[in-house]
């Protein structure tokens, strides 16, 4: 049929909770293409009806929720004007009671469910939540050994759990929990994460590089909305935290009540030698108090700021 076959690695998934997989294969999916999902080489495409438990949502296949019988090989066919690619994804569903202590260890979980903290450092765990835009995610709760995590060493920031001064006691089984809403229905997502520790620097002590900002000023009108990206390059297995701060406080904490200024969700692009990270800061409405204040982008030991300034008056208008 003229389609190139591409085989993805197996995914191990937990039953009774939502799961989504995005059919992207750059650069194939960057142009104008059509994407169709199939199960087990069936000629009938996966439904696009949003009420269906399993349906295609744009380029995604969405399971609401995943069930034990959903194990199998799924194919997404990407058709361009002059090309066709068939991507095979092997999904294996398992039953896992996260708090069942009689079950020693987990099956061969995906790598994102195995994470490493660096002893003596400030580090973070990530709750990997890959869902289409139609899924609305609530706040994330974090658990260790089935108890909700509390204490001043732990901070929840977007999809990350920040852990300061990591100790040997921080190793073990974690879970992040979030309520997902889709078409008015709610589902629980509970991702188990096995967390190990190391003393190794991991990234060879290299310093992340902030590409932008460059300790520069930005001219912006009072009352406007502004989004500024912080672009960072760093080694592939770095453990650095990336965030925006003002007055040495995380912006989400500093503007906790008004939520007028917020940090965005971090994204990254992977290159051969390094990762390029982007985390933005959004000013819903620039106020007078924002001018002249350094908004700092932090990445590990690196930092750079932007400073807002009023545009110079345009005398030609007079």
């Amino acid at each position: 049929d003229g389609c190139n076959d591409i085989f993805m690695k197996n995914e191990m998934l937990s039953a009774s909770q939502p799961f989504a997989f995005n059919c992207t294969f750059p650069p194939i999916t960057s142009g104008e293409v059509s994407v169709t999902w199939y199960k087990n080489s069936s000629k009938i495409p996966v439904s696009k009806i949003i009420q269906s438990r399993i349906h295609q949502d744009e380029t995604w296949i969405l399971f609401l929720p995943m069930e034990w019988g959903d194990s199998g090989v799924y194919q997404c066919v990407i058709k361009g004007r002059d090309s066709c690619h068939r991507i095979h994804v092997n999904l294996t569903v398992f039953e896992k009671q996260w708090c069942d202590t009689s079950v020693k260890g987990l099956p061969n979980l995906s790598d994102e469910y195995k994470q490493i903290l660096h002893l003596g450092k400030d580090d973070s765990l990530t709750c990997h939540l890959h869902f289409p835009k139609s899924c609305i995610l609530g706040p994330i709760k974090w658990y260790k050994d089935c108890n909700e995590i509390t204490g001043e060493r732990f901070t929840v920031l977007e999809t990350r759990l920040l852990v300061s001064n990591v100790s040997a006691e921080d190793r073990g089984n974690y879970a992040c929990q979030v309520i997902l809403t889709h078409s008015g229905k709610q589902y629980e997502v509970l991702n188990g994460i096995t967390v190990s520790i190391t003393e190794r620097a991991g990234y060879g002590g290299s310093v992340p590089k902030i590409i932008y900002p460059k300790n520069n000023s930005i001219e912006v009108q009072l009352g406007t909305t502004l989004i500024v990206d912080c672009n960072i390059t760093d080694t592939k297995d770095n453990t650095n935290l990336r965030c925006w701060r003002v007055n040495n406080t995380l912006v989400d904490d500093y503007y906790n009540e008004s939520k007028r200024i917020r940090e965005g969700v971090e994204t990254h692009a992977s290159f051969r030698e390094y990762n390029l990270y982007t985390v933005n800061i959004t000013f819903l409405e620039v106020k007078m108090e924002d001018y002249g204040l350094p908004f700092m982008c932090h990445a590990g030991v690196s930092a750079a700021y932007i400073m807002l300034q009023l545009p110079a008056p345009d005398f030609r208008a007079y």
């Epitope: 061969n108 002893l119 190391t198 003393e199 592939k236 297995d237």
Partner: antibody, heavy 120, light 106 residues
Framework: EVQLQQSGPSLVKPSQTLSLTCSVT??????GYWNWIRNFPGNKLEYM?????????YYNPSLKSRISITRDTSKNQYYLQLISVTTEDTATYYC??????????????WGQGTSVTVSS | EILLTQSPAIMSATLGEKVTMSCRAS?????MYWYQLKSGASPKLWIY???NLASGVPARFSGSGSGTSYSLTISSVEAEDAATYFC?????????FGGGTKLEIK
């Protein structure tokens, strides 16, 4: 159960390249740290280096110009190459990995060892 | 480079005797790891995170220490304990092993 199986020649000529393979079962080399250690005659252990879950490599500075650790994730194997060997590189070479009790540095799983003699 | 100096290099003990071997670091180490090596076998993880016994290690073994001074103790030596014991650190690269302590049974 994690198992590490080593393969490679036991005799290498001086100035040539020593190449060893570590085949891993029961774990994915895209998680954790995958190490090479050698034991010289007379029981002197030297930590040579590792390749991490992301492909990042660390080498002992004493070997940096001569050592290369690579991997093939599709085969779940990682490799050691040591160029320009001399008789001083005669040793038993081990691959090893940690993760015991969630401690990556606790090297619990070891290969069977490959005794390499450098001689013409 | 952190130098790990083990002492004694060789020690001899009688069955039932209590023995302690030392590992001294040239700079502070966060945790110490100990390995047992017997002739013709691969090293075995023996003690990790300074004081935790690996699976299968008899309870007569213990590890202790902090900073630059660490030790491995056997409360009552048995014949199967005859081996060479190495300490190792991952706190600072390059990661190093001690020179080993060979335990012989009289």
């Amino acid at each position: 159960e994690v198992q590490l199986q080593q393969s490679g020649p036991s005799l290498v000529k001086p100035s040539q390249t020593l190449s060893l393979t570590c085949s891993v079962t029961g774990a994915s080399i895209t998680s954790g740290y995958w190490n090479w250690i050698r034991n010289f005659p007379g029981n002197k252990l030297e930590y040579m280096g590792y390749i991490s879950y992301s492909g990042y490599t660390y080498y002992n500075p004493s070997l940096k110009s001569r050592i290369s650790i690579t991997r093939d994730t599709s085969k779940n194997q990682y490799y050691l190459q040591l160029i320009s060997v001399t008789t001083e590189d005669t040793a038993t070479y081990y691959c090893a990995t940690g993760g015991y009790d969630y401690v990556e540095d606790a090297l619990y799983y070891w290969g069977q060892g490959t005794s390499v003699t450098v001689s013409s | 480079e952190i130098l790990l100096t083990q002492s004694p290099a060789i020690m001899s003990a009688t069955l039932g005797e209590k023995v302690t071997m030392s590992c001294r670091a040239s700079s502070n180490v966060r945790y110490m790891y100990w390995y047992q090596l017997k002739s013709g076998a691969s090293p075995k993880l023996w003690i990790y995170l300074t004081s935790n016994l690996a699976s299968g290690v008899p309870a007569r073994f213990s590890g202790s220490g902090s900073g630059t001074s660490y030790s491995l103790t056997i409360s009552s030596v048995e014949a199967e304990d005859a081996a060479t014991y190495f300490c190792q650190q991952f706190t600072t690269s390059p990661y190093t092993f001690g020179g080993g302590t060979k335990l012989e049974i009289k």
